[in-house]
């Protein structure tokens, strides 16, 4: 008799999930020699232990503590780039500006980026059919709790000037319900962080509006100011030129506004 299996609303675990996590770990430690102390098999065991045999709607930050411990690494606290709804450009930026870090440039973020995973209560199986959706099923699912945990710790580590890249093409440029809006903003430490600088990325070629005046940006400014952190905002009118100028800052066209 086939065992009844809970059907969730979200996509199932990414195929070859264990192999992918292990391979990414090995690759990361090869690229980043300062992470040579990491035992990737132990990392996978800790990752697996966070969600295997547990109800996928009942995952806690505590479940991820062993993994958090193994994934510990030094990140320059004044070189942190947060992002919301504009991951690709943020990652392109840190690939060029190598001394800055997004969460996905750290081991834990790199391991989990773009992956989905969940298990089943009381069985050691990984569920490749479906996983809980944050909205339709439950928020305490393995993927959401993982990102909440690492995002909180990443934001806590930040100091001096923290940058955040925001998508100016979205109706809510700053979204209180995003990971940035619901987790990272509230875990910046005012005793360490002097300024949050938002970079609003424009989508349209002819878009010359000052998106720093957008009501949602004003809302972000209000939240940040109430936390005794200064706020500044810059429009990035030409993201392609912006990246080009990060690569070649001496270029004569890079002195004008981008």
């Amino acid at each position: 008799v086939p065992r009844w299996r809970q059907q969730w609303s979200g996509p199932g675990t990414t195929k070859r999930f264990p192999e992918t996590v292990l391979a990414r770990c090995v690759k990361y430690t090869e690229i980043h020699p300062e992470m040579r102390h990491v035992d990737c098999q132990s990392v996978w065991d800790a990752f697996k232990g966070a969600f295997i045999s547990k109800h996928p709607c009942n995952i806690t930050e505590e479940d991820y503590q062993p993994l958090m411990k193994l994934g510990t690494q030094t990140v320059p606290c004044n070189k942190i780039l947060l992002w919301s709804r504009i991951k690709d450009l943020a990652h392109q930026f840190t690939q060029v500006q190598r001394d800055m870090f997004t969460l996905e440039d750290t081991l834990l973020g790199y391991l989990a980026d773009d992956l989905t995973w969940c298990g089943e209560f009381n069985t050691s199986k990984i569920n490749y059919q479906s996983c809980p959706d944050w909205r339709k099923d439950c928020s305490n699912n393995p993927v959401s709790v993982f990102w909440k945990t690492v995002s909180r710790r990443f934001a806590e580590a930040a100091c001096d000037v923290v940058h955040v890249m925001l998508n100016g093409s979205r109706s809510k440029i700053f979204d209180k319900n995003s990971t940035f809006g619901s987790v990272e903003v509230h875990n910046l430490q005012p005793e360490k962080v002097q300024t949050l600088e938002a970079w609003v990325i424009h989508g349209g070629r002819e878009d010359s509006r000052d998106l720093c005046q957008d009501p949602t940006i004003k809302e972000l400014e209000s939240i940040i100011s109430k936390r005794n952190i200064q706020f500044s905002c810059k429009n990035i009118y030409r993201p392609d030129k912006f990246l080009q100028c990060v690569k070649n800052p001496e270029d004569s066209s890079c002195t004008s506004e981008i």
């Epitope: 510990t72 690494q73 030094t74």
Partner: nanobody, 116 residues
Framework: QVQLQESGGGLVQAGGSLTLSCAAS????????MGWYRQAPGKQREWVAT???????GYADSVKGRFAISRDNAKNTVYLQMHSLKPEDTAVYYC??????????WGQGTQVTVSS
């Protein structure tokens, strides 16, 4: 907060040895990684060695086989034993401690000078 105090730096002849110590102001059980970085004059700070709570270690290629990192949790201290020192090891050596996955604390640094 974690305060770190390095000691043991000094002037040594090429081929000689030194042991650096770094005392932490809190129980090192709660410190997930302890390590050493160094900065030579006019150069960027570079990673030297790390040790995690499980005792796993990692070393930069430039020091592998010559340097050894260890930690004594009872004394809240991490050590860096440096052997076969070379003039290019001359730098300020900084101790680091990482808690809660990413929050990194730095010591003030101790000068190591290797004369030829």
């Amino acid at each position: 907060q974690v305060q770190l105090q390095e000691s043991g730096g000094g002037l040594v002849q090429a081929g000689g040895s030194l042991t650096l110590s770094c005392a932490a102001s809190r129980n090192t059980d709660s410190i997930e990684i302890m390590g050493w970085y160094r900065q030579a004059p006019g150069k960027q700070r570079e990673w030297v060695a790390t040790i995690n709570t499980g005792g796993n270690t990692g070393y930069a290629d430039s020091v592998k086989g010559r340097f050894a990192i260890s930690r004594d949790n009872a004394k809240n201290t991490v050590y860096l034993q440096m052997h076969s020192l070379k003039p290019e090891d001359t730098a300020v050596y900084y101790c680091t401690a990482v808690i809660r996955t990413y929050s990194t604390y730095w010591g003030q640094g101790t000068q190591v000078t290797v004369s030829s």
